[in-house]
């Protein structure tokens, strides 16, 4: 039984449109078939959960209707997409990884990722 | 705020039952996992059985497998801990601790005494 | 299972001195680590988490260290309400368990 290792990118730039992506990797010390994936954001020593998906290994990941997240997993690498972001969601965010199923549970958490989002300038008026 | 109060302790005879609930609230209880922890008189922390976002998600230390019964009620924001086959080494105080998002245990009950002897 | 030791079983000190408690895993716990600090009839409180992070509200007179299996936390300076028992728990791995504790006491 070893710790289990999270990694993840330490910068993202979102996009104008406010979308920032990055990969979460995790080192699976046994043949989990369920597994949870968190995202939490980090502000000055506030920890808040942003959004949460559980999926078995080989399937999609599924998220609240209503999350900002979406995401995709390839064997143990989870591509999360958060969306809606804007300059005030500038901040660090983590990657929780749980293996749920079968038994014995395992914990991961990542260092996070600096996400950077920039509100795009409004469009200057045009003169016709 | 956060406030978890167990409760259900007391004396009871070897071989016999109880159930300890722990009311949680200032919460989204449903979003985090919940964990029984324990302390005999003059002894260190031992933590007993831990259970996760969805009720089928369970953990129990050796010395609780097969007697006790870790629930939850996501309806009534309430843990529970139904032990059965009590001996006089299940005395102890018991502790409700939540599982902060970060892993470790960051709130925790005051404790409820549970006195198992004849 | 992960066993985890602590030392020494008490210290003894005066308010002022510093406080340094040890606690050693049987195998790597990565940073998996947290301190709580227990004091008579009451709940433990945490005080450490993920080896070196202050919990809310905790003063920086506390302060966490290590890695691996060795992990350390530290009191700067002892303050009169500082005397307790202090116990490591590592969180990362089923099941989780916490060390034997360590009683820091006024000499």
């Known amino acids: 039984c070893k710790a289990m290792h999270v990694a993840q990118p330490a910068v993202v730039l979102a996009s104008s449109r406010g979308i920032a992506s990055f990969v979460c990797e995790y080192a699976s010390p046994g043949k989990a078939t369920e597994v949870r994936v968190t995202v939490l954001r980090q502000a000055d020593s506030q920890v808040t959960e942003v959004c949460a998906a559980t999926y078995m290994m080989g399937n999609e990941l599924t998220f609240l209707d209503d999350s900002i997240c979406t995401g995709t997993s390839s064997g143990n690498q989870v591509n999360l997409t958060i969306q809606g972001l804007r300059a005030m969601d500038t901040g660090l965010y983590i990657c929780k990884v749980e293996l749920m199923y079968p038994p014995p549970y395992y914990l991961g958490i990542g260092n996070g990722t600096q996400i950077y989002v920039i509100d795009p300038e409004p469009c200057p008026d045009s003169d016709f | 705020q956060v406030q978890l109060v167990e409760s259900g302790g007391g004396v009871v005879e070897p071989g016999r039952s109880l159930r300890l609930s722990c009311a949680a609230s200032?919460?989204?209880?449903?979003?985090?996992?919940m964990h029984w922890v324990r302390q005999a008189p003059g002894k260190g922390l031992e933590w007993v059985a831990v259970?996760?976002?969805?009720?089928?998600?369970?953990d129990y230390a050796d010395s609780a497998k097969g007697r006790f019964t870790i629930s939850r009620d996501n309806s009534k924001n309430t843990l529970y801990l139904q032990m059965n086959s009590l001996r006089a080494e299940d005395t102890a105080v018991y502790y409700c601790?939540?599982?902060?998002?970060?892993?470790?245990?960051?709130?925790w009950g005051q404790g409820t005494l549970v006195t198992v002897s004849s | 299972e992960i066993v985890l030791t602590q030392s020494p079983g008490t210290l003894s000190l005066s308010p002022g001195e510093r406080a340094t408690l040890s606690c050693r895993a049987s195998?790597?716990?990565?940073?998996?680590l947290a301190w709580y600090q227990q004091k008579p009839g009451q709940a433990p409180r945490p005080l450490i988490y993920?080896?070196?992070s202050r919990a809310t509200g905790i003063p920086d007179r506390f302060s966490g260290s290590g890695s691996g299996t060795d992990f350390t936390l530290t009191i700067s300076r002892l303050e009169p309400e500082d005397f307790a028992v202090y116990y490591c728990q590592q969180y990362g791995i089923y099941p989780f368990t916490f060390g034997p504790g360590t009683k820091v006491d006024i000499k």
């Open positions: 601790a939540r599982a902060g998002l970060l892993g470790y245990f960051d709130y």
């Open positions: 200032g919460f989204t209880f449903s979003s985090y996992g």
């Open positions: 195998q790597s716990l990565n940073s998996y």
């Open positions: 993920g080896v070196s």
């Open positions: 259970i996760w976002y969805k009720s089928s998600e369970k």
